[in-house]
């Protein structure tokens, strides 16, 4: 007649700083009342009390005030525990004891995790490098948990396991900073990449460094891209320009062209084996096939989204190899601001009013300026908030609190810093008493 208590078999994985639910359930008999229930959560190893419910009442958290039950669900047999703002130190086993007439218990494991940052790479020495020099490449990634796995490889995918030293240090919160050092002898040129994996989240963070010693290989392909970022409006098409100079007798069969995201190395589009291999990027990219033979390797990106913003690398390989990166800056114009007033009727000089200026669906974040009817800037008592929607576009709400004079005009200017596009709205408050908006 022991009470059956059920918990998940697999550990509960929780990110540091988030809330975790440790599930625990029992099957209440007909006529069961909470007055009969004794529920205790405790740390399995130390038996430290975490949370309890007894004598028909939640006895509260005994664990740094970060735990809670689900009181409305207890009567249905849900004895789960909510653990707030998870810390590394919370990792371990928690036991759920349930006693009604009979008694049962089960333990659930909490596995804490935190993603590692994108690795930063440093080189020592970092100038006047020549083939044959020994260099030390350091790959650093921060604030992850648990300890990371680190892998190195060269530009051909060959694993580099010799001459690697990896150290991991925990900070006060128990999060690890990982530093992995690779010592290599330089060839004519080389790419070295470091991959830091969080084994619990199966999350990979990687970076690479390409070292071209001073005596660069002869005849490398010169790849040209615009220096300035390409600015594209959300929803429109953008052309990322890239060109090379084909030699006499050049044929497309010799060309390997790869576009990829500079940071993640994600393939975007490729042309190999004499043909367009198509888009690997949500089917929104295209080359200019008729212009490739003339050295035009540009990429067309259709229906641009905020998430496309960043650096794209154009790799061109014929006999030799060259690459260059072009930045895409995404933008969206802000709508004409709408103005609201609170309170909006029976206004008199001396009243304090709140004027809200709202402008929608712009990118990137806006700059907001207020001024009065004489062009005098109003900077005190302004609060501006910007919220991104699912598409990454921002809605901006700016609130100005002012004391009314006999009459006054208040204008709000919303600027898109990339497009240098200004959208403005104004409100004029006159008369006494006043009503806003004016009645017909």
């Amino acid at each position: 007649g022991a009470l059956e208590v059920q918990v998940p078999e697999d550990p509960v994985v929780a990110l540091v700083g988030t809330d975790a639910t440790l599930c625990c359930s029992f099957s209440p008999e007909p006529g069961f009342s909470l007055a009969q229930l004794n529920l205790i959560w405790q740390l399995t190893d130390t038996k430290q009390l975490v949370h309890s419910f007894a004598e028909g009442q939640d006895q509260g958290s005994a664990y740094a005030n970060r735990t809670a039950l689900f009181p409305d669900l207890l009567a249905q047999g849900n004895a789960s525990l909510r653990l707030q703002r998870v810390r590394v130190a919370d990792e371990g086993s928690f036991t759920c004891f349930v006693s009604i007439r009979d008694f049962g218990s089960a333990a659930v494991s909490l596995q804490v995790a935190a993603p590692y940052s994108k690795p930063s790479m440093t080189l020592e020495p970092n100038k006047d490098l020549r083939p044959g020099d020994t260099v030390t490449i350091t790959c650093s990634s921060y604030q992850g948990y648990p300890e990371a796995e680190v892998f190195w490889q060269d530009g051909q995918g060959v694993p580099l396991t010799g001459n690697v030293t990896t150290s991991q240090m925990a900070n006060e919160q128990g999060l690890f900073d990982v530093h992995s050092i690779l010592r290599v002898v330089l060839g004519a040129n080389g790419t070295y990449s470091c991959l830091v994996r969080n084994p619990v989240l199966q999350q990979d963070a990687h970076s690479s460094v390409t070292i071209t010693p001073q005596r660069s290989p002869t005849g490398a392909v010169e790849v040209q891209v615009p220096e300035d970022p390409v600015v594209a409006l959300v929803g429109t098409d953008a052309t990322l320009r890239c060109s090379f100079s084909p030699e006499p007798g050049f044929s497309l069969a010799q060309l390997n062209l790869i576009w990829q995201l500079t940071d993640t190395k994600q393939l975007v589009h490729s042309f190999t084996e004499g043909r367009d291999q198509g888009s690997a990027y949500a089917n929104r990219t295209a080359l200019f096939p008729d212009l490739l033979a003339q050295g035009n390797a540009s990429l067309r990106l259709q229906r641009v989204r905020v998430a496309d913003e960043g650096s794209f690398t154009c790799f061109v390989s014929i006999r030799d190899f060259g690459s260059a990166a072009v930045s895409l800056q995404v933008a969206a114009p802000y709508s004409k601001p709408s103005m609201t007033l609170e309170p909006n009727k029976d206004l008199r000089p001396g009243d304090t009013v709140t004027i809200t200026c709202s402008s929608y669906r712009g990118y990137p974040e806006a700059e907001v300026f207020w001024q009065d009817g004489q062009g005098v800037p109003l900077t005190g008592n302004v609060t501006t908030s910007q919220m991104a929607n699912e598409q990454g576009l921002f809605d901006v709400h700016s609130v100005l609190r002012v004391v009314l004079g006999a009459n006054g005009t208040y204008s709000c200017l919303v600027r898109n810093p990339v497009l240098q596009q200004d959208a403005h709205g104004s409100v004029t408050i006159t008369g006494q008493p006043m009503t806003f908006p004016p009645e017909a």
């Epitope: 796995e149 892998f151 490889q153 530009g155 051909q156 995918g157 060959v158 694993p159 396991t161 060839g187 004519a188 790419t191 990449s193 991959l195 994996r197 084994p199 990687h206 690479s208 069969a253 390997n256 790869i258 990829q260 190395k265 393939l267 190999t272 084996e273 004499g274 390989s317 014929i318 006999r319 190899f321």
Partner: antibody, heavy 121, light 106 residues
Amino acid sequence: EVQLVQSGAEVKKPGSSVKVSCKASGYSFTSYTIHWVRQAPGQGLEWMGYINPNSRNTDYAQKFQGRVTLTADKSTSTAYMELSSLRSEDTAVYYCARYSGSTPYWYFDVWGQGTTVTVSS
Amino acid sequence: EIVLTQSPDFQSVTPKEKVTITCRASSSVSYMNWYQQKPDQSPKPWIYATSNLASGVPSRFSVSVSGTDHTLTINSLEAEDAATYYCQQWSSNPLTFGQGTKLEIK
């Protein structure tokens, strides 16, 4: 079209050597490593080693160390695998394969058609 | 040396059935690749960098990872999937393959 074309079948006596060729076309031969993988009858795939045709760096599986030699001729875009001191258990299909991709995603994207080597007295 | 152990060695399955093949690594690998081989043919790239389908591979194939276990799943087996599947790693020397899993259609 990217292709690796291997030389034809060979029948060899125990104790002798065999040299298999693998001619690459349709891509820059020096940009990717060439690996050799063998498969005994009814068995799985077994890695033998690789060569970087550009630097001519090689690395061999312990099992074949001292018995296998990998070479590459840039002028003809051809890789070679020579296996010496042949014994009957070396009877297998020998494949060359290109290890391709971009950092850090690499895999064997193109394989030769295979060369059958039979070792028999 | 990282040893890759595939299970099962052999599986006989009816069409439309869900199939799983597990490749267990003796220690962590950076990426796992999978190849398909049919009788008297060279191996073909099937899945690269753990979970990316190679060109032309149907979407019924997928891979999930738990610790050092990489599991290849075929959601609804078709006759053309009858083949031997190999996993492969090169996170550290030597490069190694799993022993292979042969899928046969009942």
